[in-house]
């Protein structure tokens, strides 16, 4: 039985050209996290974090994606095209798969709303 829940940063906004941290946290389960996958709105893989082996960033995003903090992901040099949904998929044993959703809005304006506590100015 899957008892866990994923907490995410929810809906966040950030400035064009700036950076933002995407964070998910799995709670209420003793399941072992084996891998976390991060995907973009069109289900493009951004990165994989394997519990034993570490991080791999997908080659196409190498210049703009940085691992961490923790199991999170940092998106850099944001463009308007980065607006959309992001998904963290937690592969766990023995529970199975948990999925969290974050919506990122990239703002043109010089002052973006600071709506997320994980955001980098």
């Amino acid at each position: 039985m899957m008892t866990g829940t994923i907490e995410t940063t929810g809906n966040i906004s950030a400035k064009k050209g700036g950076s933002v941290i995407l964070q998910c946290h799995l709670s209420s389960t003793m399941a072992q996290v084996t891998q976390v996958n991060w995907e973009q709105h069109d289900h493009s893989l951004l990165a994989i974090r394997n519990a034993e082996l570490g991080w791999h960033i997908y080659p196409a995003f190498k210049d703009r994606v940085a691992p961490g903090p923790g199991l999170g992901l940092t998106l850099q040099s944001l463009t308007m095209n980065d607006t959309g949904e992001y998904f963290c998929t937690y592969h766990t044993y023995p529970d199975g798969t948990y999925r969290g959703r974050i919506f990122l809005e990239v703002l043109e304006s010089s002052v973006a709303e600071h709506s997320a506590r994980f955001q980098i100015p």
Epitope: D42, H43, L45, I48, N50, H56, Y58, P59, A60, K62
Partner: antibody
């Protein structure tokens, strides 16, 4: 059992076009990135193209961009490679491959289909 | 482009031996390296990913190691069915690139 079966390889004249297909079975096709890789007669392997699960993003080496197009039909569990303006150096064995769910590597490959470009 | 150099195109071995195949990347690729085995008339098969993780069903006599620019594939207690071509591949950066291969043959 994961199965990838390529087809469409043929003898084609320089400047011609060809469309390769790869029929996938034994797994949920729409859950995986897919690749085309080619192998020269001297056995050198060269990455040709990659495509995301839904087909929204495609990637190619600069040397092939514009001539080759990767696409997929998830309803038909089929991967395609459209090749145009073919050159003699495109003479190769073409393999389709599936990306692993554990990492960005090709965990299963088809048996290949042979393309010969010659006049 | 990142060049993957397999300096030995051929390596001779005997059944029961231990053999080490090397691969060098022209720049740092962290641990984003895979090893494939290809037997005559067959397609490549994944052996190792993440530089050291064995793919499902791969015998434990195959061991991958390395990070950065230097990588090795070690086959301990070589069996006759291991005689094949071995290719390394980096997937740290586009374009994805492969080594030219090392052919493992009997002495």
């Amino acid at each position: 059992e994961v199965k990838l079966v390529e087809s469409g390889g043929a003898l084609v004249q320089p400047g011609g076009s060809l469309k390769l297909s790869c029929a996938a079975s034994g797994f949920t096709f729409s859950d995986y990135y897919m690749y085309w890789v080619r192998q020269t007669p001297e056995k050198r392997l060269e990455w040709v193209a990659s495509i995301t699960k839904g087909g929204g993003s495609t990637y190619y080496p600069d040397t092939l961009k514009g001539r080759f197009t990767i696409s997929r039909d998830n309803a038909k569990n089929t991967l395609y490679l459209q090749m145009s303006r073919l050159k003699s150096e495109d003479t190769d064995m073409y393999y389709c491959a599936r990306q692993s769910s554990y990492d960005f590597v090709m965990d299963y490959w088809g048996q290949g289909t042979s393309v010969t470009v010659s006049s | 482009d990142i060049v993957m150099t397999q300096s030995h195109k051929f390596m001779s071995t005997s059944v029961g031996d231990r053999v080490t195949i090397t691969c060098k990347a022209s720049q740092d690729v962290d641990t984003a390296v895979a090893w494939y085995q290809q037997k005559p008339g067959q397609s490549p098969k994944l052996l190792i990913y993440w530089a050291s993780a064995r793919h499902t069903g791969v015998p434990d006599r195959f061991t991958g190691s390395g990070s950065g620019t230097d990588f090795t594939l070690t086959i301990s207690n070589v069996q006759s069915e291991d005689l094949a071509d071995y290719f390394c591949q980096q997937y740290s950066n586009y374009p994805l690139t492969f080594g030219v291969g090392t052919k493992l043959e009997l002495k």
